[in-house]
């Protein structure tokens, strides 16, 4: 199948709703975490104030075979205006510290909750 069309949808999701859905998914991940998330995989830490959505995706996309974060990876791909592939790092991404996926998710969740409270849906 080579001809691909858009998935049917009732219409664009408002940014506030999209952000809330991402927060809910991250909450779900943190609450349902039993064993170490993604077998304790390490990812690059990111600057949460600089081009955060693409940077978060660039970091998490390098984790493969972890079903717990697949939905998050899909959601973040919609939050980033350019296509992100594994091993790709934009100039916004400072690669100096690696942290566990579980900590990455917690840090991202805290920051997104703060943005949501402040009404920063852009």
């Amino acid at each position: 199948l080579t001809c691909l069309g858009g998935f049917a949808s009732p219409g664009p999701v408002p940014p506030s709703t999209a952000l809330r859905e991402l927060i809910e998914e991250l909450v779900n991940i943190t609450q349902n975490q039993k064993a170490p998330l993604c077998n304790g995989s390490m990812v690059w830490s990111i600057n949460l104030t600089a081009g955060m959505y693409c940077a978060a995706l660039e970091s998490l996309i390098n984790v493969s075979g972890c079903s717990a974060i697949e939905k998050t990876q899909r959601m973040l791909s919609g939050f980033c205006p350019h296509k992100v592939s594994a091993g790709q790092f934009s100039s916004l991404h400072v690669r100096d510290t690696k942290i566990e996926v579980a900590q990455f998710v917690k840090d991202l969740l805290l920051h997104l909750k703060k943005l949501f409270r402040e009404g920063q849906f852009n």
Partner: antibody
Framework: EVQLVQSGAEVLKPGATVLISCKVS????????MHWVQQAPGKGLEWMGR????????KYAPKFHDRVTLTADTSTDTAYMELSSLRSEDTAVYYC???????????WGQGTLVTVSS | QAVVTQEPSLTVSPGGTVTLTCRSS?????????ANWFQQKPGQAPRTLIY???NRAPWTPARFSGSLLGGKAALTLSGAQPEDEAEYYC?????????FGTGTKVTVL
């Protein structure tokens, strides 16, 4: 050399549907998101939506979401934009554009003029 | 839906400096809006000047620079040339869609 070549100008009646193609060369279409932009005569630019040609996943602007359909044929490296229920205010130039981090919207098609007139 | 506003028109003297701004109705513009700036001349397709807030496209002259200024995206043209006379548009990303600015007509006079 990266090129985006769009189909030719169209003159259509209100209520009709237009399909514009954007044939790319110099890169693989599945490696990038393809965006579409509208520009009415003497007016500004308006983002219509984008498609990930790899899996067909789309994002549409609220204004266009119920009338626009973006598709891609990966076998021919061609993106398509279909706009239905045309009205006179849809008279515009439509551009396809390649977006990637290292030069967002860096490459544009030449534009396709669509004239809607009864 | 957000509205992205630019100055309708600005005039700059040859060799002079002018700053164009891009304001979001939803609040301060941030790096997560991935601001883009375009130049468009009559009868031509737009041409990308700045992407990701402050990155120049390979063909963009050094006299153009992008930044965040007072909660807005800004494009500064230092040392204006006659060929810089054009319409300039910004575009901001809002989590899942772009919105283009209203456009600024820059006259070099």
């Amino acid at each position: 050399e990266v090129q985006l070549v769009q189909s030719g100008a169209e003159v259509l009646k209100p209520g009709a549907t237009v399909l514009i193609s954007c044939k790319v060369s110099g890169f693989t279409i599945t490696d990038y998101y393809m965006h579409w932009v509208q520009q009415a005569p003497g007016k500004g630019l308006e983002w219509m939506g984008r498609i990930d040609p790899e899996d067909g996943e789309t994002k549409y602007a609220p204004k266009f979401h119920d009338r626009v359909t973006l598709t891609a044929d990966t076998s021919t490296d061609t993106a398509y934009m279909e706009l239905s229920s045309l009205r006179s205010e849809d008279t515009a130039v439509y551009y396809c554009t390649r977006y990637d981090y290292y030069g967002p919207f860096a490459y544009w098609g030449q534009g396709t003029l669509v004239t809607v007139s009864s | 839906q957000a509205v992205v506003t630019q100055e309708p028109s600005l005039t700059v003297s040859p060799g002079g400096t002018v700053t164009l701004t891009c304001r979001s109705s939803t609040g301060a513009v941030t790096t997560s809006n991935y601001a883009n700036w375009f130049q468009q001349k009559p009868g031509q397709a737009p041409r990308t000047l700045i992407y990701g807030t402050n990155n120049r496209a390979p063909w963009t002259p050094a006299r153009f620079s992008g930044s965040l200024l007072g909660g807005k995206a800004a494009l500064t043209l230092s040392g204006a040339q006659p060929e810089d006379e054009a319409e300039y548009y910004c575009a901001l990303w809002y989590i899942n869609h772009f919105i283009f600015g209203t456009g600024t007509k820059v006259t070099v006079l």
